[in-house]
Each structure stands twice: as structure tokens, then as C-alpha cells.
């Protein structure tokens, strides 16, 4: 586990008598903030996931109103990093996006509004505790100035964060099996523990010291049900005491989406699904082309080359919305089988099996009839996840143990009544019947014949007596 | 206005090394990168590495592996890009180039060097 | 490495003609291509950066477009001074490298 920290050092007009004017003016005063988003720069998810490894929004810089006749200037800042906690090993090499967005501060309706300036992007190689790296990039008309490092956080060391160290607890070496830790020779390795007390069945850590809950529990072991039957609204924060849902005001009321566009509540904050032809937060882009990128997270932009005409993004797997900007609920494809929990941990899918089941989506089905004995010569049958018996004639329950009345489905037909015995079940029968449930009518003449077939049973089905 | 004006044409054995200079005016030097590509004849262009003015990091293609060393002198805006163990491979037109990293505006006027025994 | 391929490898046309060359990334590169322009016995001459983006003093009939691994520079009227090598060149990964160049030939 660690942290990747971007600090911008700068955004201006690029060098050039062609330099743009400032976003901001005296009519529409303006700050700028910046969105980093990081993704593991080699692995087949990177295409295909947002963020995978992380995003960060910065805080909001000074407002900024430009000097009437001055030339533009490198805009003010949000003080301080953006950093990207990651829970995982730091990969080594990732991809980046950078967005320069400008908020508007002046008489809007319903708030401040939003429009991207500039988004850079590149691939990078970067060890994990080493020194900062300085890039500089164009976008558009505008320039970018940064550096970015990854550092790991203790107990983590290493150039991909996934070393663990103490402090040695005897001066003089590790415990069995634990080597030091270079370059920190007087601490050791240490081993992954979750919190303590942090419950095996509803709990799981991915570092240590973590206890991180199943979809359904609350509490910092994970041991408290969430119940929302005696919570007045669904929405607001949730309360580790008591699992409740704790009402909130609402981030979509008002609907701060733009230009037709829908708005649904996010864990954080909200997320509005533009119509096409408008992006940006709010929606609130628009004239765009594909040569302007409006497709987010790996999509495909396709037509679109002058601002009348529409763009489509073609979006890659797990995307989705008209600029690719909604991730797919890829639990809602019910991946985890055999009643497995579906967990979306963003960078991957993981399923917790019920017990009898395994495997990356619970498809394997563990021997339940492993130590499991069905009583009175029944016999285990495999599957479910669970072990069930087929019992023996005159025998029912779950192990076989419950002796059956084998009567009780009345299976005497036309008034035969009913014996138990010791193989099963004996009919006797009404007059003018007979077989083995007294199914058969007997002809005056002595002679029987089969009727039509009884419900459940076809003609030439064999029939099946005791 | 921005100029990159580079050292003259040189003529190597194999074996040996060369340094070529690029001197940059015209703005603020150590505002930007100072990139050197090369170009064989007739081909190609291939990006070498670059050098930071401001913090003397250095970043190289490992086609070049440890024999490209890039340096700069302040006082004087100038880079240096030195190339060793030549091969008749290595003979080409080596530019520099003022940019970011993605980006070089602009290109010094080129630097033949050619290696021959 | 990423690769970039170009296409057509050469191309003759005539003055006032509309040209477009082609650039094929071998994987997708967002936005991050430049285009160059190269007479004999000269520097590279920057003309397009960030796919779209036209630098400075550079003649308005140059346009790029594209994004991801497809990418399009475009001459709207060719002029005699148009007629050179040009190259493509991404710059999302390092080492940033460049296309085999299109060279562009007075019919």
C-alpha cells in the first residue's frame, strides 16, 4: 500500500504569439481545480477500467479575474498534492490522465459551472520511493507543469510497496522465517495480519491491520448487520453503531446536470449521464467533436468532425453512457455462481463462496459429502453446496433419521386403504380394483386392462409397483 | 526569437566517441527540455533521450543502453550530447530539439557525424 | 515499444489538391500524436501536436484529427512549399517514436 503524489507546479498559455486569453474575466471571474486519474500502465485492465489504480480530485484554486489588455498569465493554483491512495502493490509502470478543469463563479443558475480546459495523458515508469519525476505537456493552446511520485506507507517498503516491515522485536534477528528488511536492516519482514477480532465470515483485509466489510455488515469488525428497517430514509452516511442509514440532503436535488442530462447519486457526490453532443461534469461541454475527446475510459470516438454533427463512442467491456463515463455494474451480470457474494473492489471482481463452493467465481463444487454419513442406508448425494440424503424406503429428513409415514400421501387409489410395512407400503383394495395402488378397474368378465394413462404418466411409461 | 544552434560536423573511427553541442537562446533555458534525436540517411527518426536543464535528470532510449551521456552548462545555455563506442551504425544526423514530453517546437539545425575507419 | 505505422509510404499529387496521411498506432495513445514536416537537408518543423492542436505560425490548411491508434493529418489546398516528408510521433510512452514518414511528391 501507498500513495501517488502529483503537485502541479503550473498551468498557462503554452509559448507563442497564438497563446490563448485567460479562461477567466471580469464578467466571469473563475478558479481552476485538477482531476488525476491513474491506471496500471500494462495490464489488461487498464483499457477497460476507470481508475483502476485511483483518482483524486484537487481542492479549488484562487479565484482569478483576468486584468483587462494583460497577457495571460500562469493561473493560481489549489495549494497542496493530489493524492492517490493505492491498496495494492504499485505496479511500476502507469498510465495517467490529468484534467484541468475551470469553475465558473459567476450568476449561474443552480451554481457554479464546470467545463474542461485541458486533459493530458501518458505512460509512465516509476519506482515506489523514488524521487520526484517532472513532466511538462502540452494541451490545446495551454501548458502543464507537474511531478508525481509514488511512496509506499508503513509498513510497506520496497520499489512496489509490497514488502512489509517491523521493528525488530530482538535486537539481534527476525523470527523464523522473517528476513530483514533492506534497506531498513533494523526492522523485518512482517506478515499479513487483519485487525484484530476483524470477523472471518463478513470481514477481509487486503494490508494490514484492515478490516474491510462484505456488502450487508457494518461496524470496525464488520460483526454489526446493516439494517435500515428502523432508519427513516435510505440516503446519508452510514452509522457504524448502529447501521443505520442516517438521513442527508440529497446531492442530484436541483439537478445540477445540464443540457438534458440525468443525474444519479454516487457514494461521494453525483454523476450526470449527458445526452450526446455534451460532456464535462455537469454536462455542460458542448459543440464537441471527436477531435475534443469525449470519450472517456479507453472508448472509441466515431463520426463527429465538425461540431453539427454528433459523435458516437463506441465503449470498451464495463463501460457504458454516451461518453463512456459510467461504469457498468458488473456485479448486476450476477458473475459469482452458485449463490456466491459478488464484491466490485474496482480494479477487479471477487467472489466470497458459500461454503461447499470455490474458485475466482465459485464454480467449483467441494465434496459435500465429504465426513457426512445419511443414517438407515441412505445415500449422499453432492450438490448445492450442501450434502442431502436419498433415504431408504420407509425414511425421510435430512441424515434419514425421521422414519416416514409412508401412508400419509394417500397413494391408495379408488378407496384402497392403506398398511405400512416393513418394505414400504401395502394397498388393499376396494372391490372391483386392483394393482398394486389399486389403479385397475377388474372387468365383469375377470379379464383387467390398462386405462388411459394417469396423470404424470404417459402411454408405454413403465409403471412402477411395490 | 528560440534558436538551437549546433557544434559542426564531425568524422569518428569506430570505437571512439563523440560530443556534440547544442546552444539554445532566444528564452529562458532551463524552462524546457532539451530532447536529441538522430536520423540515419535515408530513414527515420529516432528519439536518443533527453536532459532537464533545471535538475540535470537525465532520460535515454535503451537502444543506447550506457552510451549516451547528456550534460548542460548554464552559463552558457548549451547541452551536450556525447555518444561512445561508435559503430558505422551510429552515422547520422543528430538534432536537438527545445519540448516537453510531448512535444518539440523547436529544432536545432542538425549535426552529421559520421563513423568510418 | 509503441510502433506507429504510416501510410500511404509515398504520395504524388498536385498543387491545390486535398491530401490526407494516415498514422496507425499499435495501441491506443489517447490523443498524444504530433505531426512534423521535413525537407531535404533540414530540421524537423513542428506542425501538429496533441492530434488537433496546430502550432504556431503554421499555415491553416494543415489539420489533425484523431484519437486512440487512428490518426489523420490533412492538406486542405496543397501548396509548392507543401511538398516534403512528413512523419507522425507519439509521445504517451517512453521512448516517444516516430512513424516511417510519407513523402509527398509534385505529380
Known amino acids: 500500500a501507498g500513495v501517488f503524489e502529483l503537485q502541479i507546479h503550473s498551468f498557462g498559455p503554452g509559448p507563442g504569439p497564438g497563446a490563448p486569453r485567460s479562461p477567466c474575466s471580469a464578467r466571469l471571474p473563475c478558479r481552476l481545480f485538477f482531476r488525476v486519474c491513474l491506471k496500471p500502465g500494462l495490464s489488461e485492465e487498464a483499457a477497460e477500467s476507470p481508475c483502476a489504480l485511483g483518482a483524486a480530485l484537487s481542492a479549488r484554486g484562487p479565484v482569478y479575474t483576468e486584468q483587462p489588455g494583460a497577457p495571460a498569465p500562469d493561473l493560481p493554483l489549489p495549494d497542496g498534492l493530489l493524492q492517490v491512495p493505492f491498496r495494492d502493490a504499485w505496479p511500476g509502470t502507469f498510465s495517467f490522465i490529468i484534467e484541468t478543469w475551470r469553475e465558473e463563479l459567476g450568476d449561474q443558475i443552480g451554481g457554479p459551472a464546470w467545463s474542461l480546459l485541458a486533459r493530458v495523458a501518458g505512460r509512465r515508469r516509476l519506482a515506489a520511493g523514488g524521487p520526484w519525476a517532472r513532466d511538462i505537456q502540452r494541451a490545446g493552446a495551454w501548458e502543464l507543469r507537474f511531478s508525481y511520485r509514488a511512496r509506499c506507507e508503513p509498513p510497506a517498503v520496497g520499489t512496489a510497496c509490497t514488502r512489509l516491515c517491523r521493528p525488530r522485536s530482538a535486537p539481534s534477528r527476525c523470527g523464523p522465517g522473517l528476513r530483514p528488511c533492506a534497506p531498513l536492516e533494523d526492522e523485518c519482514e512482517a506478515p499479513l495480519v487483519c485487525r484484530a477480532g476483524c470477523s472471518p465470515e463478513h470481514g477481509f483485509c487486503e494490508q494490514p491491520g484492515e478490516c474491510r466489510c462484505l456488502e450487508g455488515w457494518t461496524g470496525p469488525l464488520c460483526t454489526v448487520p446493516v439494517s435500515t428497517s428502523s432508519c427513516l430514509s435510505p440516503r446519508g452516511p452510514s452509522s457504524a453503531t448502529t447501521g443505520c442509514l442516517v438521513p442527508g440532503p440529497g446531492p442530484c436535488d436541483g439537478n445540477p446536470c445540464a443540457n438534458g442530462g440525468s443525474c444519479s447519486e454516487t457514494p461521494r457526490s453525483f454523476e450526470c449521464t449527458c445526452p450526446r453532443g455534451f460532456y464535462g461534469l455537469r454536462c455542460e461541454v458542448s459543440g464537441v467533436t471527436c477531435a475534443d475527446g469525449p470519450c472517456f475510459n479507453g472508448g472509441l470516438c466515431v463520426g463527429g468532425a465538425d461540431p453539427d454533427s454528433a459523435y458516437i463512442c463506441h465503449c470498451p467491456p464495463g463501460f457504458q453512457g454516451s461518453n463512456c463515463e459510467k461504469r457498468v455494474d458488473r456485479c448486476s451480470l450476477q458473475p459469482c455462481r452458485n449463490g456466491g457474494l459478488c464484491l466490485d473492489l474496482g480494479h477487479a471482481l471477487r467472489c466470497r463462496c458459500r461454503a461447499g463452493f470455490a474458485g475466482p467465481r465459485c464454480e467449483h463444487d467441494l465434496d459435500d459429502c465429504a465426513g457426512r454419513a445419511c443414517a438407515n442406508g441412505g445415500t449422499c448425494v453432492e450438490g448445492g453446496g450442501a450434502h442431502r440424503c436419498s433415504c431408504a424406503l420407509g425414511f425421510g429428513g435430512r441424515d434419514c433419521r425421521e422414519r416416514a409415514d409412508p401412508c400419509a400421501a394417500r397413494p391408495c387409489a379408488h378407496g384402497g386403504r392403506c398398511y405400512a410395512h416393513f418394505s414400504g407400503l401395502v394397498c388393499a383394495c376396494a372391490p372391483g380394483y386392483m394393482g398394486a395402488r389399486c389403479e385397475f378397474p377388474v372387468h365383469p368378465d375377470g379379464a383387467s386392462a390398462l386405462p388411459a394413462a394417469p396423470p404424470g404418466l404417459r402411454p408405454g411409461d413403465p409403471q412402477r409397483y411395490l | 526569437q528560440v534558436q538551437l544552434v549546433q557544434s559542426g560536423a564531425e568524422v569518428k573511427k569506430p570505437g571512439a566517441s563523440v560530443k556534440v553541442s547544442c546552444k539554445a537562446s532566444g528564452y529562458t533555458f532551463t524552462r524546457y527540455w532539451i530532447h536529441w534525436i538522430r536520423q540515419a540517411p535515408g530513414q527515420g527518426l529516432e528519439w536518443m533521450g533527453y536532459?532537464?536543464?533545471?535538475?540535470?535528470?537525465?532520460e535515454h532510449n535503451q537502444n543506447f543502453k550506457d552510451r549516451v551521456t547528456m550534460t548542460r552548462d548554464t552559463s552558457t545555455s548549451t547541452v551536450y550530447m556525447e555518444l561512445s563506442s561508435l559503430r558505422s551504425e551510429d552515422t547520422a544526423v543528430y538534432y536537438c530539439?527545445?519540448?516537453?514530453?510531448?512535444?518539440?517546437?523547436?529544432w536545432g539545425q542538425g549535426t552529421t557525424v559520421t563513423v568510418s575507419s | 515499444a509503441i510502433q506507429l505505422t504510416q501510410s500511404p509510404s509515398s504520395l504524388s499529387a498536385s498543387v491545390g489538391d486535398r491530401v490526407t496521411i494516415t498514422c496507425r498506432a499499435s495501441e491506443n495513445i489517447y490523443y498524444n500524436l504530433a505531426w512534423y514536416q521535413q525537407k531535404p537537408g533540414k530540421a524537423p518543423k513542428l506542425l501538429i501536436y496533441t492530434a488537433n492542436s496546430l502550432e504556431d505560425g503554421v499555415p491553416s490548411r494543415f489539420s489533425g484529427s484523431g484519437s486512440g491508434t487512428d490518426f489523420t493529418l490533412t492538406i486542405s489546398s496543397l501548396q509548392p512549399e507543401d511538398f516534403a516528408t512528413y512523419f507522425c510521433?507519439?509521445?504517451?510512452?517512453?521512448?516517444?517514436?516516430f512513424g516511417g514518414g510519407t513523402k509527398l511528391e509534385i505529380k
Open positions: 530539439a527545445r519540448g516537453g514530453s510531448n512535444f518539440f517546437d523547436y
Open positions: 536532459i532537464n536543464p533545471t535538475t540535470v535528470y537525465t
Open positions: 510521433k507519439q509521445a504517451y510512452d517512453v521512448p516517444p517514436t
